[in-house]
């Protein structure tokens, strides 16, 4: 029932505007005049609705219907005109509030003294507001009763309805603006400082970038003391035995060197960055890889025979007998290093395969991958 809705919205807005304008203790004559004008408009509206009720009996007489409809149209136009006046008045007061907000800064110290008076005034205003709300509720009831009779006239009044809705929408926007001003003023009064929150959690680690170009070979440095034992390289054939070096005192661990070229022998040495855990023998188990100094597992997404083949061959086995999913050899405890690994099957180690991302949060240890290598 559009009439009820429009009147109730207007009533609520009127209440909000009154609160917004009086709730700050700016009891200037201008504001009091605005209240009076507003209440007068509301009173006029009430009288006009009462007039519609009085004319209700005349509706039965079809002879007077058309004349009545035209009169009603005229009355709604009057209401629309009054709403426009009200809108202009509210706009004027919006400008006044802008100026008031500017002067509030300089009045800040004075307002602190007035705070007690404001609280008393607020109490009175709340009483007045409560009374106004009761009156508006009664008015809403009356309007609801009237709206039942007016429903028959809805077709002729569609155009008018749209216009009034538009005006109410504008009024809503103004009210919201006033509410916002009210909030800004209260924030100024409370002197609240907003503190920036802590930074968010770090994003996921980016994909590994492509290998950079090799730089030119540098001049050989002096023979340094031996570093800590590095990771074992990929399967290579042993070269000829070198001459024994001078014994040196142990030094700091040096950076990992580049992978050497294959020698000419035929002995397979396993790639120590991969191990099999939890199987019946060394040829099978949950696949664990050493990365960043920590052993971790591989998620079984896209875990297929070609990947298992690479793992087994890198460990010195001739091939893969089976690949296992869903933590077949038990769940690991370390990080889940890899989610999706893609191999064609002939790569010398799993690191040579296409790895989308190191360190994944998309899997759980219930999806740890395993292999059984052929003996």
């Amino acid at each position: 029932k559009w009439e009820t809705k429009n009147c109730s919205v207007s009533s609520t807005n009127a209440n909000d505007i009154t609160q917004s304008l009086t709730g700050k203790g700016n009891d200037s004559e201008e504001e009091m005049r605005f209240q009076e004008v507003f209440m007068e408009h509301m009173s006029n509206m009430e009288k006009r609705i009462q007039h519609i009720l009085d004319m209700e009996a005349n509706l039965m007489d079809t002879e007077h219907f058309q004349n009545f409809s035209m009169t009603t149209d005229q009355r709604f136009n009057d209401i629309l005109l009054q709403l426009s006046t009200l809108f202009s008045s509210v706009q004027g007061h919006g400008n006044a509030i802008d100026e008031i907000s500017k002067s509030l800064i300089s009045l800040n110290t004075t307002l602190l003294d007035l705070q007690l008076n404001i609280e008393n005034l607020n109490g009175k205003i709340q009483e007045n507001t409560f009374k106004q709300q009761e009156e508006i509720s009664k008015l809403e009831e009356r309007v609801y009763n009237v709206s039942a009779e007016i429903m028959a006239m809805k077709e002729e009044q569609v155009h008018l309805e749209q216009e009034i809705k538009g005006e109410v929408k504008v009024l809503n926007n103004i009210t919201n603006d006033l509410r916002l001003k009210d909030w800004e003023h209260s924030q100024t009064l409370r002197n609240i400082t907003l503190i920036q929150g802590p930074p968010g959690p770090p994003g996921e680690k980016g994909d590994r970038g492509p290998t950079g170009e090799s730089g030119p070979r540098g001049f050989p440095g002096p023979i340094g003391p031996p570093g800590l034992k590095g990771d074992r390289g990929a399967i290579g054939f042993p070269g000829s035995r070198g001459l024994p070096g001078y014994a040196g005192r142990p030094g700091n661990s040096g950076p990992k060197g580049q992978k050497g070229e294959k020698g000419s022998g035929n002995t397979l040495t396993p790639f120590t960055k991969v191990r099999l855990v939890g199987g019946s023998g060394p040829h099978e188990g949950r696949v664990e890889i050493l990365h960043s100094g920590q052993w971790g597992t591989i998620c079984d997404d896209r875990w297929e025979v070609r990947v298992g083949q690479v793992v087994c061959r890198s460990l010195g086995y001739p091939g893969v007998q089976a690949v296992h999913k869903a933590a077949h050899f038990g769940q690991g405890t370390g990080p889940i290093w890899l989610n999706e690994v893609f191999c064609f099957g002939r790569e010398s180690s799993i690191e040579e395969c296409k790895i989308r991302q190191w360190g994944t949060r998309a899997c759980s240890h219930s999806e740890d991958a395993g292999v059984t290598c052929t003996l």
């Epitope: 590994r208 492509p210 290998t211 170009e213 090799s214 896209r302 297929e304 025979v305 070609r306 083949q309 091939g319 893969v320 893609f342 191999c343 064609f344 099957g345 002939r346 790569e347 040579e352 395969c353 296409k354 790895i355």
Partner: antibody
Framework: QVQLVQSGAEVKKPGASVKVSCKVS????????IHWVRQVPGKGLEWMGG????????IFAQEFRDRVTLTEDTSPDTAYMELSSLKSEDAAVYYC??????????????WGQGTLVTVSS | DIQMTQSPSSLSASVGDRVTITCRAS??????LNWYQQKPGKAPKLLIY???SLQSGVPSRFSGSGSGTDFTLTISSLQTEDFATYYC??????????FGQGTRLEIK
């Protein structure tokens, strides 16, 4: 050490089909992937299709999508490439090759000896 | 699809010469470029992968460089067995794999 041995030369009529085989040794067929590349005499190399581990399926170059069929027989570890509706432009040497990832990129380090297919009416 | 263009299409040189072949991609392919050598009646042979990594067993006189769209294959001192056709191949887009049209290296 992987080895790829292809079937012998073929002479076909336009509209017919040709089936080239590629026998794998050193690995089983399930342990690696086979791709096919052709070379028209006096021209460059043209990739036809093969298994993509990222997609988990065999994919083809647009030009061959409707005419080429790639199959595998695991008991003799042999891969097959069948090209249908032959045209004179299909006369070429057909190679099977096995890829691997080289620093995340795809490279072909083992090739079959090639099979010459002649299309003549 | 990514187009690969090699230049020159043919080249004459003498034993001992330093030879450079270039390959240009139609869009940036990072360093995902390989070089192959092919001799008449034979299958291609991988020389260099990912722009500059020398394949095992390939003589050190072969070297590769470049990144993005422009790449070069250099033979520092040409030997008799190096006279062949050379192809570049990109694998940036995974599939379709595309090759250059080839550069034929002949004896002067």
């Amino acid at each position: 050490q992987v080895q790829l041995v292809q079937s012998g030369a073929e002479v076909k009529k336009p509209g017919a089909s040709v089936k080239v085989s590629c026998k794998v040794s050193g690995y089983t067929l399930t342990e690696l992937s086979i791709h096919w590349v052709r070379q028209v005499p006096g021209k460059g190399l043209e990739w036809m299709g093969g298994f993509d581990p990222e997609e988990g399926e065999t994919i083809f170059a647009q030009e061959f999508r409707d005419r080429v069929t790639l199959t595998e027989d695991t008991s003799p570890d042999t891969a097959y490439m069948e090209l249908s509706s032959l045209k004179s432009e299909d006369a070429a040497v057909y190679y099977c090759t096995t890829p691997r990832y080289c620093n995340n990129g795809i490279c072909y380090d083992y090739w079959g000896q090639g099979t010459l297919v002649t299309v003549s009416s | 699809d990514i187009q690969m263009t090699q230049s020159p299409s043919s080249l004459s040189a003498s034993v001992g010469d330093r030879v450079t072949i270039t390959c240009r991609a139609s869009q940036s392919i990072s360093n995902y470029l390989n070089w192959y050598q092919q001799k008449p009646g034979k299958a291609p042979k991988l020389l260099i992968y990912t722009a500059s990594s020398l394949q095992s067993g390939v003589p050190s006189r072969f070297s590769g460089s470049g990144s993005g769209t422009d790449f070069t294959l250099t033979i520092s001192s040409l030997q008799t067995e190096d006279f062949a056709t050379y192809y570049c191949q990109q694998s940036y887009s995974n599939f379709p794999i595309t090759f250059g049209q080839g550069t034929r290296l002949e004896i002067k």
